[in-house]
């Protein structure tokens, strides 16, 4: 049954030129995770498939690294990286769970990490 919840890193900020880890965690379900898709708006960044492993979209290969775990590391951040990121968990038998992270890339060094929060 779709009893799961996704916990994400929430609203986060990072410095231009730096890196950031996007993390989601699915809990409260016994469903099998078959694949996690990481997307920015409508662009697919990366896939972590339980059988086939990681695939990074060619256009992001230079700046995206898999992990840690099912998370995603964004490197060499630019102001254009500001925006919404989604972790989409494909599971069986539950179906799809989606988590949202908002990343703000700042020019200065005042970037602070936001609090963790839950998405049902």
């Amino acid at each position: 049954m779709m009893t799961g919840t996704i916990e994400t890193t929430g609203n986060i900020s990072a410095e231009k030129g730096g890196s950031i880890i996007l993390q989601c965690h699915l809990s409260s379900t016994t469903a099998q995770v078959t694949q996690v898709n990481w997307e920015q708006q409508d662009q697919l960044l990366a896939i972590c498939n339980a059988d086939l492993g990681w695939h990074i979209s060619p256009s992001f290969k230079d700046r995206v690294a898999p992990g840690p775990g099912l998370g995603l590391t964004l490197q060499s951040l630019t102001v254009n990286d500001t925006g919404e990121y989604f972790c989409i968990y494909h599971t069986y038998p539950d179906g799809t769970y989606t988590g949202r992270i908002f990343l703000e890339v700042l020019e200065s060094s005042v970037a602070e990490h936001g609090a963790r929060f839950q998405i049902p």
Epitope: M1, M2, N49, T96
Partner: antibody
Framework: QLQLQESGPGLVKPSETLSLTCTVS??????????WGWIRQPPGKGLEWIGS???????WYNPSLKSRVTISVDTSKNQFSLKLSSVTAADTAVYYC???????????????WGQGTLVTVSS | DIQMTQSPSTLSASVGDRVTITCRAS??????LAWYQQKPGKAPKLLIY???SLESGVPSRFSGSGSGTEFTLTISSLQPDDFATYYC?????????FGGGTKVEIK
């Protein structure tokens, strides 16, 4: 328009292996949001879920048939297949392949079905 | 396994009638219930999902309700095209299981 088409022998002898293939057209079997399943229906009876598969090969089977069932996928041919071993007359049924679609918040649903193929187990 | 029990097994009705079919689950499945329509020699067609959500393209005379263990499918005004067999299916817990079917026939 997505279409699913079952193919395979219509007659199988007792104790042999039933083999069916489902060919998917009008869409990719390798989509992350879809799972692909087999359901059967004995003549004049209800529906029974046999099992399902993900494009990358993960499988889930009905425990009542698990010891005899193998479902596989061939993404290069946009096909998935069913093998049911040691068949008896009780396995005579119309076999359907179907797509299980995942939508956020709604679970997985059999939204597209093949037209079904009758398999008779008889000597 | 979760047992799905439908009633009645056969229902005789006339065009224009309001028809109600019941489905009971042997344990709670929350709202993870679907309804399918099947005509002779054809594959089942999805009508309702998540107990009460109407599948795209399905006429609004079909509606679903219920949660937990008791569910109903209602056809507000039976049309000639609606004479068929209807199945409920739980999709909350593996293995997926279906009800035994309700045949809606012409009175």
């Amino acid at each position: 328009q997505l279409q699913l088409q079952e193919s395979g022998p219509g007659l199988v002898k007792p104790s042999e292996t039933l083999s069916l293939t489902c060919t998917v057209s009008g869409g990719s079997i390798a989509s992350s949001v879809y799972y692909w399943g087999w359901i059967r229906q004995p003549p004049g009876k209800g529906l029974e879920w046999i099992g399902s598969i993900y494009y990358s090969g993960s499988t889930w089977y009905n425990p009542s048939l698990k010891s005899r069932v193998t479902i596989s996928v061939d993404t290069s041919k946009n096909q998935f297949s069913l093998k049911l071993s040691s068949v008896t007359a009780a396995d005579t049924a119309v076999y359907y392949c179907a797509r299980e679609a995942g939508r956020t918040g709604t679970g997985l649903l059999f939204d597209y079905w093949g037209q079904g193929t009758l398999v008779t187990v008889s000597s | 396994d979760i047992q799905m029990t439908q009633s009645p097994s056969t229902l005789s009705a006339s065009v224009g009638d309001r028809v109600t079919i019941t489905c009971r689950a042997s344990q709670s499945i929350s709202s993870w219930l679907a309804w399918y329509q099947q005509k002779p020699g054809k594959a089942p067609k999805l009508l309702i999902y998540k107990a009460s959500s109407l599948e795209s393209g399905v006429p609004s005379r079909f509606s679903g309700s219920g949660s937990g263990t008791e569910f109903t499918l209602t056809i507000s005004s039976l049309q000639p095209d609606d004479f068929a067999t209807y199945y409920c299916q739980q999709y909350g817990i593996l293995p997926r299981t279906f009800g035994g079917g309700t045949k809606v026939e012409i009175k």
